[in-house]
Interface confidence: medium
């Protein structure tokens, strides 16, 4: 931020009233009026330049410090060149010298040269030549100056002419405050800027109302440098709960808005299915029926535990069971959707029920289902199932209700036989098969039908209470299609899958296991 | 020594024109700001018009605005006063004056000019 | 325009006499004053500008005086050469104007 200037004197602002003391009197500087740009203007004057050795002094009146430590003095004023007069003017000068003088009174019209201290020779940059003279083009120069530490109450300047030909239109000074400050939302008062040039005055910022420092944040700090120029700004303020930054205020968020957290963020709009909020709000309530989970963020729409499974079938093969279904109507707004699935059987000869989940099993873990499908295996023939299929998404625990569809589906075959050629010859196969054990006791016999490939009008059958046979009596280097049956005193269970097994060739003979 | 010398008075009927002349010598006469004053007989001293030394800017009275014209050329040290449209109260001696800043002991200088040098005059009369 | 009244319009004074001729402006033209000398059939002469400075080869009995809109020309001890009218003059402003002079006659 731009420094700012406190005036002391300024002599332009004055209107040729301030009275300036000259020494030696009535002689050397001299106050006069022209006029610039139709408007009169007052200048100190000298122009001894013919005269030879001068010493003329003007004297301000005395300023009062007050609380400055660092005054800067700006001065605007012109010097004739010394070749614009005859002869050159040989004691001619092109520059006069700056004095202060600190004191804690008034000396009034006691001036005493020995009292000053020389600031510094000023000199112009650019010197008024004659045609700039005849053609009254006032070449101004400006020239700053500081001093400082000062101590006592008060201090003259004092400007001492050598034989120039110079007038003062501007004597202005001033010190220097950083401004009062509103950054980051924080408060910086206005404060006095310091007398040492490499110094920086640190000052702490004060949170504007309803900001606050950010948790881990750093408390708002400023430096005031010698220039009043505010500098390396550090830490800062964010708007609370429920305010936002609106220019360098925090502004309560407006009804039907919230903020839940100190943050430069703006109030944001109450999601859907939430209630109005009132002004300030940190966050907005859920409508009835409708829930925020734990981890959801106030941003987040309130939302309501899904509908259940929209359409649910169970395909029975044998003894398994595929499950499908398809996502809830529904979903409560959520994309968290997963889905449990449970097992009931029931033996139909007592009606009895009970869990099922310790005999089953499942294609994929049954709880925190994510995909729509799940198929269930060894099942036992001859019972009735009823699989439960729940949908749930993170605001099911919320409420107590569940959303579920439930299918039925009786198993009234075995499983097919797993089947595999153990052995092969010119003339024989041999076969086996597996079936899951809770079935097996559920079989009386296993059926063994095998025929010629490409032969439709015979087959053979043959009966075995074991795992195994061996066929027979066939011909070399020729397929056959073999397909292995469960019997069981309820009527055949599901058949296997045809195999097709080729006899070895001839020249190939001997037993070759597969 | 400063010498400014008019020339080109004379008797001319009201309406008329005339062009009065200044010869200078004895000073730079590019450095000076020159002017014209006129002296109406039996009367006080009236300016009339000033011309900057390189030949800008110009002022005229207002009673001569729009038919007097001044001019000057440097490299014939002279000073013109070309005046048309002649009245009988435009009968007078007109003097040629000269300011040179250098000898003005002053800063800044003043808004206008006083004159430091003039010449003998020259009388112009307007008369039917 | 501003106006330049002199007083009085004419005086008698001896020799040696002190004679102070003063000039009014309409408005406040600061220092910015000069006095000329004028004799009959002759130009005018320039005595004094920024109201109390001296021209170069001006009798030091001549002096000014005054600032803003009240100005006085003093000649300490009146000599036979004196004799003349004498004018003033503004140049605060481009309109140059003179006052309608003051003759100075022997008594």
């Known amino acids: 931020a731009q420094g700012k200037e406190v005036v002391l004197l300024d002599f332009a602002a004055a209107g040729g009233e301030l009275g300036w003391l000259t020494h030696p009197y009535g002689k050397g500087w001299d106050l006069m009026q022209n006029i610039m740009n139709d408007m009169p203007i007052y200048m100190y004057s000298v122009c001894n330049v013919m005269s030879g050795d001068q010493d003329n002094w003007l004297r301000t009146n005395w300023v009062y410090r007050g609380e400055a430590e660092r005054i800067f003095i700006e001065l605007k004023f012109t010097v004739r060149d010394c070749n614009s007069f005859p002869g050159g003017a040989s004691s001619c000068k092109e520059t006069f010298n700056l004095y202060y003088a600190e004191s804690d009174l008034d000396y009034g019209t006691n001036f005493q040269k020995r009292l000053f201290t020389k600031i510094d020779t000023i000199a112009p940059d650019e010197i008024t030549v004659s045609s700039d003279f005849e053609a009254r083009h006032v070449k101004l120069n400006v020239e700053e100056r500081s001093v400082g530490p000062l101590t006592r109450k008060g201090f003259y300047l004092a400007f001492q002419d050598i034989g120039a030909c110079v007038a003062l239109l501007s004597v202005r000074v001033y010190y220097k405050k950083c401004p009062e400050l509103l950054q980051g939302l924080a408060h910086f008062p206005e404060t006095i800027a310091g007398s040492d040039a490499p110094s920086l005055a640190t000052v702490a910022g004060t949170c504007v109302d309803h900001a606050v420092v950010p948790p881990g944040g750093e408390e708002p700090r400023m430096h005031c440098a010698v220039d009043g120029e505010w500098l390396v700004p550090i830490g800062q303020c964010l708007c609370q709960a429920g305010y936002e930054k609106v220019e360098d205020a925090c502004q309560a968020c407006s009804p039907g808005f919230f903020k839940f957290e100190a943050s430069e963020s703006p109030c944001l709009e109450c999601p859907e299915h939430t209630l109005p909020s009132p002004e300030g709000a940190t966050s907005c309530e859920c409508e009835e029926g409708f829930f925020r989970a734990p981890q959801d963020p106030a941003s987040m729409p309130c939302t309501r535990p899904p509908s259940a499974p929209h359409y649910l079938t169970a395909v029975g093969m044998g003894a398994k069971v595929e499950l499908r279904w398809t996502p809830p109507q529904d979903s409560g707004g959520r994309e968290d959707i997963v889905y449990s699935v449970t097992c009931e059987q029931c033996w139909p000869e007592s009606g009895e029920c009970g869990p099922c989940e310790a005999s089953v099993r499942y294609s994929e873990p049954p709880h925190g289902l994510t995909r729509t499908s799940v198929t269930v295996s060894d099942l036992e023939p001859h019972m009735n199932y009823t699989f439960t299929v729940e949908a749930r998404n993170g605001v099911s625990g919320l409420v107590t209700s569940r959303s579920f569809r439930t299918a039925s589906v009786s198993i009234n075959q075995t499983e097919p036989p797993k089947v595999r050629l153990e052995g092969r010859s010119t003339t024989s196969l041999s076969v086996s098969w597996s079936i899951p054990p809770p079935q097996q006791s559920r079989v009386w016999k296993y059926e063994v039908t095998y025929r010629k490939k490409g032969d439709s009008n015979s087959y053979n059958v043959r009966r075995t209470e074991g795992f195994s046979v061996t066929l027979d009596d066939l011909a070399p280097d020729t397929t056959y299609l073999v397909q292995v049956q469960a019997l069981t005193q309820e009527g055949q269970g599901a058949g296997s899958k045809v195999h097709e097994f080729q006899t070895l060739s001839p020249e190939g003979s001997g037993n070759l296991a597969v | 020594e400063v010498q400014l010398l008019e020339s080109g008075g004379g008797l001319v009927q009201p309406g008329g024109s005339l062009r009065l002349s200044c010869a200078a010598s004895g000073f730079t006469f590019s450095h000076y700001m020159m002017a014209w004053v006129r002296q109406a007989p039996g009367k006080g001293l009236e300016w009339v018009s000033r011309i900057g030394p390189s030949g800008g800017p110009t002022h005229y009275a207002d009673s001569v605005k729009g038919r007097f014209t001044i001019s000057r050329d440097n490299s014939k040290n002279t000073l013109y006063l070309q005046m048309n449209s002649l009245r009988a109260e435009d009968t007078a001696v007109y003097y040629c004056?000269?300011?040179?800043?250098?000898?003005?002991?002053?800063?800044?200088?003043?808004?206008?000019?006083?004159?430091?040098?003039w010449g003998q005059g020259t009388l112009v009369t307007v008369s039917s | 325009d501003i106006q330049m009244t002199q007083s009085p319009s004419s005086l008698s004074a001896s020799v040696g006499d002190r004679v102070t001729i003063t000039c009014r402006a309409s408005q406040s033209i600061s220092t910015w004053l000069a006095w000329y000398q004028q004799k009959p059939g002759k130009a005018p002469k320039l005595l004094i500008y920024?109201?109390?400075n001296l021209h170069t080869g001006v009798p030091s009995r001549f002096s000014g005086s005054g600032s803003g809109t009240e100005f006085s020309l003093t000649i300490s001890s009146l000599q036979p050469d004196d004799f003349a009218t004498y004018y003033c003059?503004?140049?605060?402003?481009?309109?140059?104007?003179f006052g309608q002079g003051t003759k100075v006659e022997i008594k």
């Open positions: 003059q503004q140049y605060q402003s481009y309109s140059r104007t």
């Open positions: 920024k109201a109390s």
């Open positions: 004056a000269g300011y040179d800043s250098g000898y003005d002991y002053v800063a800044v200088a003043g808004p206008a000019e006083y004159f430091q040098h």
